[in-house]
């Protein structure tokens, strides 16, 4: 039994982690600067998307890049519990706090803000430079989706790395996982064409859920053959003229559930991965 | 002046490097196994490409993946001169060999075979599983293109890493370079839509040359609207019914020079990067 409550311990761990973050701001500031620069570069490359076939390619391309970038950037989250492993074991055994207090304290003070920032920065910069769908709900759905991708990827990193002593193996494993997840995200291969004995792998792909949600959010209702004189040409039938046609070709459900089920899946993955990470920390004591 | 000729020294360095390679086969065998597995996985995912809009997406996707995979795999080439840096300085100062002998010896025995193998393996496995263009010249052009991409990416790795003492900085720099090169390769963004003040960056992108060559090689003469006569003049700006239309939309020159200029560009990059790497080794002595 502990002399202090869970909430008191949570506050204490959070405060210390946050102080460490502010006391060593180089990493945080560097991450923000890199994100801003990358956001501006992406914004400049894709500036002012067209409503034609190049507009389809560029929209899909930039949404794919943002999703996979969120995943690969989250690999750095492997350090969260690895770097302080010895300190955690020492303090936990000394009765300073519960595992749960340490776990949630670190998440709240470190993971939550550091994974939220890039999503906010990217969306604010990229959205208006590219001229994505000009509605408030679409803007916030994009921001929320990028956050969910970052959190699920980071949670996966924690689940793999928690309790380990070296970062490198976890990093390698994460990178390999994300490469395969990236293939199954839906840009490099049309998911409707994959053989059934392999296609189930798409359901384990974090970027697939993020990319599908971002596409659903952006493509729905878009016209990619605007003003095409529809009285003339038959070969135009092979064009993808609406966002709905594009989404259907990608095997994406057009209903509202077709959007939100991706966030539900990401939320489930976050819960599962964080549970694994928590259990790995919990069983650390037995082997230390 | 040296008592032995350049050719003798070259043979000696090559033989020693090759013996090291055979004496420690785990790395080489591991690389081959990983390449075979990845080739089979890619072959299974993309098995039997269709001749419709999904066929366009899947062809572009797999060619993009193979190109970028060749680039990112080549990051490991940074180790070639870094790991043996102290040994090289010691032996060079002791008059064992010329810088040129060591340089070309290492290239011939280590870089040449280890970068050639993945290209051969990938092409042999993927080409027939996917059902790419069934002509011998297209098969060997693909193999040659993947080799050229691997060599230029490895040369860039050597140019960055030569003379350095630690691998990590060079690896990070390479990865960042390849991420930007990947954006400019032509899948994630339609290169014809990039603003002129930025579009010149595509000419420094290794995967762009590889991807363009592979697409030119594969798409030319293909029909993606089965049932529509491919010779019909398509005045619809939005439909992509032939490989030529697809290539034109991507801003790719349809002439034979539109294919071979990519290999010329990659060859020039190889020469430039290897020259930089050689000069960096040459000037190492001054600072050691």
């Amino acid at each position: 039994s502990y002399t202090t409550s869970f909430c008191h311990q949570l506050r204490w761990v959070s405060k210390r982690s946050f102080k460490n973050l502010l006391g060593n701001p180089q990493a945080s500031i560097a991450q923000i600067i890199v994100t801003v620069i990358l956001g501006l570069v992406i914004g400049a490359i894709y500036f002012g998307l067209n409503n034609d076939s190049t507009g389809i390619q560029n929209r899909a391309g930039v949404l794919f890049f943002l999703t996979t970038n969120q995943c690969f950037s989250s690999v750095s989250a492997v350090e969260l519990f690895v770097v302080e492993k010895k300190l955690f074991i020492h303090e936990y055994i000394s009765g300073y706090y519960r595992v749960s207090s340490y776990f949630f304290g670190k998440l709240l003070s470190d993971l939550l803000p550091m994974r939220m920032l890039p999503s906010i920065i990217f969306t604010c910069i990229v959205y208006f430079m590219l001229g994505l769908k000009p509605t408030a709900d679409a803007f916030f759905i994009m921001m929320f989706t990028l956050m969910m991708v970052a959190y699920s990827a980071s949670s996966m990193a924690l689940a793999i790395a928690a309790g380990q002593s070296v970062v490198s193996v976890a990093t390698l494993l994460m990178t390999i996982c994300f490469v395969f997840m990236m293939i199954f995200s839906g840009l490099l291969v049309n998911l409707t064409t994959i053989a059934s004995w392999l296609s189930w792998l798409q359901y384990f792909s974090i970027p697939r859920y993020g990319f599908t949600a971002l596409q659903h959010n952006e493509f729905l209702g878009q016209n990619f053959c605007p003003g095409l004189n529809a009285t003339v040409n038959n070969t135009c039938n092979y064009a993808t003229c609406t966002g709905e046609e594009y989404l259907t070709k990608q095997g994406i459900d057009l209903s509202p559930w077709g959007l939100w089920k991706n966030h539900v899946a990401l939320a489930c993955m976050i819960v599962i991965f964080l549970t694994i990470a928590y259990l790995k920390l919990l069983f650390l004591k037995k082997y230390s | 002046s040296y008592t032995t000729s350049f050719c003798h020294q070259l043979r000696w360095v090559s033989k020693r490097s090759f013996k090291n390679l055979l004496g420690n086969p785990q790395a080489s065998i591991a690389q081959i196994i990983v390449t075979v597995i990845l080739g089979l996985v890619i072959g299974a995912i993309y098995f039997g490409l269709n001749n419709d809009s999904t066929g366009i997406q899947n062809r572009a996707g797999v060619l993009f993946f193979l190109t970028t995979n060749q680039c990112f795999s080549s990051v490991s080439a940074v180790e070639l001169f870094v790991v043996e840096k102290k040994l090289f300085i010691h032996e060079y100062i002791s008059g064992y060999y010329r810088v040129s002998s060591y340089f070309f010896g290492k290239l011939l025995s280590d870089l040449l075979p280890m970068r050639m193998l993945p290209s051969i393996i990938f092409t042999c496995i993927v080409y027939f599983m996917l059902g790419l263009k069934p002509t011998a010249d297209a098969f060997f052009i693909m193999m040659f293109t993947l080799m050229m991409v691997a060599y230029s990416a490895s040369s860039m790795a050597l140019a960055i890493a030569a003379g350095q003492s630690v691998v990590s900085v060079a690896t990070l720099l390479m990865t960042i370079c390849f991420v930007f090169m990947m954006i400019f390769s032509g899948l994630l963004v339609n290169l014809t839509t990039i603003a002129s003040w930025l579009s010149w960056l595509q000419y420094f992108s290794i995967p762009r040359y590889g991807f363009t060559a592979l697409q030119h090689n594969e798409f030319l003469g293909q029909n993606f609207c089965p049932g529509l006569n491919a010779t019909v003049n398509n005045t619809c700006n939005y439909a992509t019914c032939t490989g030529e239309e697809y290539l034109t939309k991507q801003g790719i020159d349809l002439s034979p020079w539109g294919l071979w200029k990519n290999h010329v560009a990659l060859a020039c990059m190889i020469v430039i990067f290897l020259t930089i790497a050689y000069l960096k080794l040459l000037f190492l002595k001054k600072y050691s």
Partner: antibody
Framework: EIQLQESGPGLVKPSQSLSLTCSVT?????????WTWLRKFPGNKMEWMGY???????NYNPSLRSRISISRDTSKNQFFLQLNSVTTEDTATYYC???????????WGQGTLVTVSS | DIQMTQSPSLLSASVGDRVSLSCKAG??????LAWYQQKLGKPPKLLIY???SLQTGIPSRFSGSGSGTDFTLTISSLQPEDVATYFC????????FGSGTKLEIK
């Protein structure tokens, strides 16, 4: 010259299904384009309802997606509209038209007035 | 949905007059706007697409202008057969129509 003609009952009871047919002459519906249903309410407001493409792909107005269905009979060169659970609000003149995607409509049917009333 | 607002809802003009009808979009629709003419008991007839392109077979007295959110249909010299209701349609995002302007002769 392509011609489109709507047909169907002029009176439908609330909560029932509205079914309309569009017969196309002068062009085969599987050869191309998107075959669209629109309606004009008594207050002059026009609404795009959805389409079925030459390939059979259907696209509906999100506000109607839960109760609309567009189908076709290629042998008769006809396409159909079914609107379920109608209310008096669905009273309108229903048009079929040809276009590509969301683009302007150069070809229209004459329109058929459907009244929803008990 | 993008709201399309047409003004005025009723317009009276004399034969030979230059007449301008306005259509405002709730948000930017680029130049993806079409104009239709609908006479009583008839289906709508496409006049203008892409804001200013005249549909084949339409008299040259009809012209369209505007981009973004503000658009105008102009009849350079009003004819008796031009009495009708005029609709605008945006096709930038999904497709929506204006509520129409009824044009009559004084």
């Amino acid at each position: 010259e392509i011609q489109l003609q709507e047909s169907g009952p002029g009176l439908v009871k609330p909560s029932q299904s509205l079914s309309l047919t569009c017969s196309v002459t002068g062009y085969t519906i599987t050869s191309g384009y998107d075959w669209t249903w629109l309606r004009k309410f008594p207050g002059n407001k026009m609404e795009w309802m959805g389409y079925i493409s030459y390939s059979g792909f259907t696209n509906y107005n999100p506000s109607l997606r839960s109760r609309i269905s567009i189908s076709r009979d290629t042998s008769k060169n006809q396409f159909f509209l079914q609107l379920n659970s109608v209310t008096t609000e669905d009273t309108a003149t229903y048009y079929c038209a040809r276009t590509r995607g969301y683009n302007p409509f150069p070809y229209w049917g004459q329109g058929t007035l459907v009244t929803v009333s008990s | 949905d993008i709201q399309m607002t047409q003004s005025p809802s009723l317009l009276s003009a004399s034969v030979g007059d230059r007449v301008s009808l306005s259509c405002k979009a709730g948000r930017n629709v680029n130049n993806y706007l079409a104009w239709y003419q609908q006479k009583l008991g008839k289906p709508p007839k496409l006049l203008i697409y892409n804001s200013n392109s005249l549909q084949t077979g339409i008299p040259s007295r009809f012209s369209g202008s505007g981009s973004g959110t503000d658009f105008t249909l102009t009849i350079s010299s009003l004819q008796p057969e031009d009495v009708a209701t005029y609709f605008c349609q945006q096709y930038n995002s999904w497709t929506t129509f204006g509520s129409g302007t009824k044009l009559e002769i004084k």
